[in-house]
């Protein structure tokens, strides 16, 4: 790669590197999102005692957050690359409505919440390029998502705080499982 013109000693181009592979870039993207989730969790846990609460089951009834199961082929036992990739993409698409819900839930981390949402969209694009069997991926129904969003936003303050905490925790767990599975692909 040509060094750009007009270089001076304090402003030199980075050394030439091997281009990023699809797997490397997806790995970095997931870690980027996980760092974002950590930043958001920090604000959530500082603002309320949700992170230590034992009443999670009350809020969890309202949520249908994506989870990895044995049948999804993402665990070491019964690992199936194609089935797992479909599950990861489908799960991320299902999380999008919950990430939309998070957008108005943060005061000092508004920009970070937006970054997590947008970087998830990018991750989905990267993974869709990798997937061979795109027909097997079911996209959530927009009408169902819209009514879910309305329902979540109508909850009382305590439930909204708990929902925020649960979304972040579940999303973190889903991404961690995805990261482990993708490293086997």
């Amino acid at each position: 790669a040509p060094v750009p013109p007009g270089e001076d000693s304090k402003d030199v181009a980075a050394p030439h590197r091997q281009p990023l592979t699809s797997s490397e870039r997806i790995d970095k993207q997931i870690r980027y999102i996980l760092d974002g989730i950590s930043a958001l969790r920090k604000e959530t846990c500082n603002k309320s005692n949700m992170c230590e609460s034992s009443k999670e089951a009350l809020a969890e009834n309202n949520l249908n957050l994506p989870k990895m199961a044995e049948k999804d082929g993402c665990f070491q036992s019964g690992f199936n690359e194609e089935t797992c990739l479909v599950k990861i993409i489908t799960g991320l698409l299902e999380f999008e409505v919950y990430l939309e819900y998070l957008q108005n839930r943060f005061e000092s981390s508004e920009e970070q919440a937006r970054a997590v949402q947008m970087s998830t969209k990018v991750l989905i694009q990267f993974l869709q390029k990798k997937a061979k069997n795109l027909d097997a991926i079911t996209t959530p129904d927009p009408t169902t998502n819209a009514s879910l969003l309305t329902k979540l936003q109508a909850q009382n303050q305590w439930l909204q705080d708990m929902t925020t905490h649960l979304i972040l925790r579940s999303f973190k767990e889903f991404l961690q499982s995805s990261l482990r599975a993708l490293r086997q692909m």
């Epitope: 790669a1 750009p4 270089e7 402003d11 030199v12 181009a13 980075a14 050394p15 030439h16 590197r17 281009p19 990023l20 699809s22 870039r25 970095k28 993207q29 980027y32 999102i33 760092d35 974002g36 930043a39 970070q112 937006r114 970054a115 997590v116 947008m118 970087s119 969209k121 990018v122 694009q125 990267f126």
Partner: nanobody, 131 residues
């Protein structure tokens, strides 16, 4: 061979518009943060705009804010710089560059206009604003 290719430069009248494109060969542009730089004769190179690959956020130098728009189409693996309300002082060779400045959450967006953040550079396309 790994290279970036800019296109869309040309001669335009003051107040006019021009759209530049940046494409890559030998690697995937969608995986990199992209910056547009420019260099006028006898002047130092300056970063004008950049766009993240991680969260698609953008940054603009004050000199082009409100007039230039950077965007990317990951499906086409192309980055664009739409330039409106062009002024004679926008005359320069425009370069696109690809780097990994955006892979850490919480990166400082304004750093993206520093050339040391970039690994790959194009050969440039001439933009002339004159009546």
């Amino acid at each position: 061979q790994l290279q970036l290719v800019e296109s869309g430069g040309g001669l335009v009248q003051p107040g006019g518009s021009l759209g530049l494109s940046c494409a890559a060969s030998g690697f995937t542009l969608a995986y990199y943060g992209i910056g547009w730089f420019r260099q006028a004769p006898g002047k130092e190179r300056e970063g004008v705009a950049c766009i993240s690959s991680s969260d698609l956020s953008t940054y603009y130098a004050d000199s082009v804010k409100g007039r230039f728009t950077i965007s990317r189409d990951n499906a086409k693996d192309t980055v664009y710089l739409q330039m409106n309300s062009l002024k004679p002082e926008d005359t320069a060779v425009y370069y696109c560059a690809a780097g990994t400045w955006d892979l850490k959450f919480g990166y400082s967006r304004s750093n993206c206009v520093r050339s040391y953040e970039y690994d790959y550079w194009g050969q440039g396309t001439q933009v002339t604003v004159s009546s």
